[in-house]
């Protein structure tokens, strides 16, 4: 009898630990291949899949390009975007470029946002080349408050990649705040 | 299908100023440099300068950068080269022209005859 | 600037037999493992024709007697076996480095 008080004990201790791991916030989005911007100035990136492919979301809310947080706690964000041309696509307009993304926290209630993390590198891209490939990942740990935002800004948004395993940004939750 | 349709022949003044025009069409206008390239009467070709109409970025040979003067407007997907101060040496044929998708200069306009005469 | 020389400029040849043009740069023209450099036919009142690109491949359309060849400063354009329709200003061209050059023209006169 002990032992299959033990055993019951230990199944609703899994079941518990289990329904906290599925209720802990995460969401893994990748590009709208079909809605990138055009041009060279830096823009925000609006156009997200959250839910084919690669991409996911639970207890996060996607709205307006932006991914809100709904539950306070500290979160892992990360993005990866990145660079490519080739040839038969068309010209650069410049071969010098300046490659940036920048992940973004928009707050509602005191209206404010702050660049919580930004990458990139200026590079040379001859016009001579057949083919051209930059990569950028950038990941951090943030104390994120319920209602908040995460966007994305990047530069030379016609030159994105737009494969899934290619430019996508997300976040999950760690931990509670005490 | 790729085209340029450049504008009709133009008879001009010494010292006057003429601009021709390249409609583009059958592909994205503001992706690809659009190039100039003079040939005079029975003479070889001469490149130019080119403009990349997205952002109006511009070339130019060195001997023609107090000639001509590139624009180009994308709504109406149509580039323009303004020819200045014309003089005999600017009668000549102007050809608009774009790359290839793998090089060279694949796709011409069918030209614009300038002749300058007093 | 890059010039370009072709030789000869003038060509006369009979039906049939084979037609070489060379067009020599004043620098070289590869980079990135390729030879910026191609050939252009104009026939007469006619915008000029793109026959070769990237030294040695043949544009779509183009017949394939014709063909190029050679790499950084020396080029050539080979007709294997001219036809009548030949009869033209043929044209070498880089655009490796800016501004983009044409050599002074071979023309081809058939027999």
């Known amino acids: 009898i002990r032992a299959e008080k033990a055993m019951v004990d230990g199944s609703w201790l899994d079941l518990a630990k289990r329904s906290k791991l599925e209720a802990q916030p995460f969401a893994h989005l990748t590009i709208n291949a079909t809605d990138i911007p055009s041009g060279s100035h830096k823009v925000s990136l609006s156009s997200w899949y959250h839910d084919r492919g690669w991409a996911k979301i639970s207890n996060m809310t996607f709205s307006n390009g932006k991914l809100i947080v709904n539950q306070d706690g500290f979160y892992y964000l990360y993005a990866n975007i990145c660079f490519r041309h080739h040839e038969t696509s068309g010209d650069l307009a410049t071969e010098y470029l300046q490659l940036m993304v920048y992940v973004t926290k928009t707050s509602i209630k005191i209206p404010s946002s702050h660049t919580l993390m930004k990458g990139g590198s200026t590079k040379y891209w001859s016009g001579n080349s057949e083919f051209h490939f930059y990569s950028i990942n950038v990941g951090g740990f943030f104390k994120l408050r319920s209602g908040e935002e995460i966007s994305i800004e990047v530069s030379n948004p016609s030159l994105l990649d737009p494969d899934q395993d290619a430019t996508y940004f997300g976040a999950f939750k760690v931990r509670d705040i005490d | 299908q790729v085209q340029l349709q450049q504008s009709g022949a133009e008879l001009a003044s010494p010292g006057a100023s003429v601009k021709l025009s390249c409609k583009a069409s059958?592909?994205?206008?503001?992706?690809?440099?659009l190039q100039w390239v003079k040939q005079r009467p029975g003479q070889g070709l001469e490149w130019i300068g080119a403009?990349?109409?997205?952002?109006?970025?511009?070339k130019y040979t060195q001997k023609f950068k107090d000639k001509a003067t590139l624009t180009a407007d994308k709504s109406a997907s149509t580039a323009y080269m303004q020819l200045n101060s014309l003089t005999s040496e600017d009668s000549a044929v102007y050809y608009c022209?774009?790359?290839?998708?793998?090089?060279?200069?694949?796709?011409w306009g069918q030209g614009t005859l300038v002749t300058v005469s007093a | 600037n890059i010039v370009l020389t072709q030789s000869p400029a003038s060509l006369s040849v009979s039906l049939g037999q084979r037609a070489t043009i060379s067009c020599r740069a004043s620098?070289?023209?590869?980079?990135?493992?390729?030879?910026?450099m191609h050939w252009y036919q104009q026939r007469p009142g006619q915008a000029p024709r793109l026959l070769i690109y990237?030294?040695?491949n043949l544009e779509s359309g183009v017949p394939a007697r014709f063909s190029g060849s050679g790499s950084r400063t020396d080029f050539t354009l080979t007709i294997s076996s001219v036809e009548a329709e030949d009869e033209a200003t043929y044209y070498c061209?880089?655009?490796?480095?800016?501004?983009?050059?044409f050599g002074g023209g071979t023309k081809l006169e058939i027999k």
């Open positions: 990237l030294a040695s």
């Open positions: 022209a774009r790359r290839g998708s793998r090089r060279g200069i694949a796709y």
């Open positions: 061209q880089q655009d490796n480095e800016d501004p983009y050059t």
């Open positions: 059958g592909y994205t206008f503001t992706t690809y440099w």
């Open positions: 403009i990349y109409p997205g952002p109006g970025n511009t």
């Open positions: 620098e070289s023209v590869d980079s990135y493992g390729r030879s910026f």
